[in-house]
């Protein structure tokens, strides 16, 4: 074992090139200078090293940079990035969007790994906030990125960044995440006119309160059923039959197909059957005529 630690005569690497793929692990360890490797990291990606050989190269970099790699090295890690652990990445200080893009490219096509999640977190925290350029980049690689942020983290996204969000970026967000994003979207799009505003705000409406839905119902927006079904149940329940009819416009007929599903089912139970009948859709389950409706939420508030 002791003999193997010395580099054999004539095998000392002068540069990082294809000849190194024929080196055994111990030869790589003994014959490749870590500083040389660091300055020529961009070449590693073009050489078909085995996983075992990549382990050796990573080990050399770890020894050279025990406190974490400099960005000049990180940017050129290429496939070596896949060898990094979240613990390694927590030591990094990544500030360049180009570095982030280079590393995300390596992981392209795969779901977000703990390594990538940590890298993104380090990058965003280093910048201080999730700005538009970063959000553009992240959602391009991971359309579900925004929904992988907790409501706590989403709450720090500046409203200006909301312009970068596409409807598909919100597909996997839950109601609590939309609760946080909706007021930001409302702020971001506040200067748009009615129809343009609705197009932009539509994907965020899962976080809209009752009063905003009531306001939209006065604007001839013709909300589709898919959007209506994603609204908060507690926001839909107080809407009158007339308001829902105005909100959905020609799409109101779709209520029949959804009458057994939330929020439609719960909304029907809160409406007078007489009012439901005015829609002419055969919706059943409303409050029969002559029954007194107690507003339990008001009663609870008073007690």
């Amino acid at each position: 074992e002791v003999e193997k630690t010395a580099c054999p005569s004539g095998k000392k690497a002068r540069e990082i090139d294809e000849s190194l793929i024929f080196y055994k692990k111990w030869e790589l360890e003994a014959c490749v200078d870590a500083a040389l490797l660091a300055t020529q990291m961009d070449r590693v990606n073009a050489i078909p090293f085995t996983y075992e050989q990549l382990d050796v190269l990573k080990h050399k970099l770890d020894e050279l940079y025990p406190q974490g790699y400099p960005e000049s090295v990180i940017q050129h890690l290429g496939y070596l990035f896949l060898k990094m652990s979240p613990e390694d990445i927590r030591k990094w200080n990544v500030t360049s969007l180009e570095t982030l893009k280079a590393l995300l490219e390596v992981n392209k096509g795969h779901e977000m790994s703990p390594q990538v999640a940590t890298l993104i977190d380090r990058f965003v925290k280093g910048r201080g906030q999730l700005d538009k350029d970063t959000l553009d980049t992240l959602t391009a690689f991971y359309p579900g990125y925004l929904c992988s942020l907790s409501p706590e983290e989403l709450s720090s996204v500046p409203p200006s960044s909301i312009w970068a969000v596409r409807p598909q970026d919100l597909d996997t967000c839950d109601p609590r995440q939309l609760d946080v994003l909706y007021p930001k979207a409302r702020l971001a799009f506040q200067n748009m006119n009615g129809s343009e505003y609705f197009v932009k705000i539509q994907s965020f409406l899962g976080g809209a309160p009752t009063e905003d839905l009531k306001a939209l119902s006065q604007q001839n927006v013709s909300m589709d059923l898919a959007t209506f079904m994603k609204l908060r149940t507690d926001a839909v329940l107080p809407l009158t039959v007339a308001e829902v009819q105005k909100l959905l416009g020609p799409h109101v007929e779709g209520l029949k197909a959804e009458e057994r599903h939330r929020p439609v089912r719960d909304w029907i139970l809160r409406q007078r059957q007489d009012d439901l009948d005015t829609l002419g859709l055969g919706l059943q389950g409303g409050i029969p005529n002559g029954y007194l409706v107690l507003d339990l939420s008001m009663q609870e508030a008073l007690s």
Epitope: E111, P114, A117, T118, I120, D121, K125, G126, G128, Q129, G144, C147, S148, S150, P151, E152, E153, S155, S156, T172, C173, D174, R176, V180
Partner: antibody, heavy 118, light 112 residues
Framework: EVMLVESGGDLVKPGGSLKLSCAAS????????MSWVRRTPEKRLEWVAT????????FYPDSVKGRFTISRDNAKNTLYLQMNSLRSEDTAMYYC???????????WGAGTTVTVSS | DVVMTQTPLSLPVSLGDQASISCRSS???????????LHWYLQKPGQSPKLLIY???NRFSGVPDRFSGSGSGTDFTLKISRVEAEDLGIYFC????????TFGGATKLELK
């Protein structure tokens, strides 16, 4: 070294108030959401409050909503918890904790004891 | 609220034993984004809780590989392959998929 140090715990009567503080060091405080979590005498952990990194949003469970207020001063690297209308069931060890990138509490302080008793 | 139920409440072991703690949630912990936010914490005597495992099976920084997490949906398990003295303490599972964030009722790992 990343550190969180709580202070302000005390014995207080039911209905009383108390303000806890948490001094953070060793990391960029202003980049992280922060939380308070408590451990009850029955050894249960309960999440109490969270505030986002810039202090513009707060989150609470129903059990403390309206009574407790979480706040922060990023210039002083300090997190606070103002507790009003205290009840005996608020008796616990209160921990300050950092909210991490995978929706977990990754750094905890040593805790400060709050006892609500007449 | 999502109720997290841990079993057993107490787990007497000998050093070197394998230990297994179960955690069951009252509803699925799979978030609509595909992730499962189920974590495990250890609180040693006289110390604050420390994160061990995040998102079901990922070991946190510095956690020995004798700790492993598994499970899906509503049923999860923490295993310690060979218990060491420093592993003794109270274990908590926790979910952050749903609001409010909730913790399991605690399992005390102690010597027989």
């Amino acid at each position: 070294e990343v550190m969180l140090v709580e202070s302000g715990g005390d014995l207080v009567k039911p209905g009383g108030s108390l303000k806890l503080s948490c001094a953070a060091s060793g990391f960029t405080f202003s980049s992280y959401a922060m939380s308070w979590v408590r451990r009850t005498p029955e050894k249960r952990l309960e999440w109490v409050a969270t505030i986002n990194s810039d202090g513009s949003y707060t989150f609470y469970p129903d059990s403390v909503k309206g009574r407790f207020t979480i706040s922060r001063d990023n210039a002083k690297n300090t997190l606070y918890l103002q507790m009003n209308s205290l009840r005996s069931e608020d008796t616990a060890m209160y921990y300050c904790a950092r909210w991490g990138e995978n929706w977990y509490f990754d750094v905890w302080g040593a805790g400060t004891t709050v006892t609500v008793s007449s | 609220d999502v109720v997290m139920t841990q079993t057993p409440l107490s787990l007497p072991v000998s050093l070197g034993d394998q230990a297994s703690i179960s955690c069951r949630s009252s509803q699925s912990l799979v978030h609509s984004n595909g992730n499962t936010y189920l974590h495990w914490y250890l609180q040693k005597p006289g110390q604050s809780p420390k994160l061990l495992i995040y998102k079901v099976s990922n070991r946190f920084s510095g956690v020995p590989d004798r700790f492993s997490g598994s499970g899906s949906g509503t049923d999860f398990t923490l295993k310690i392959s060979r218990v060491e003295a420093e592993d003794l303490g109270i274990y908590f599972c926790s979910q952050s998929t749903h609001f409010p964030r909730t913790f399991g009722g605690a399992t005390k790992l102690e010597l027989k």
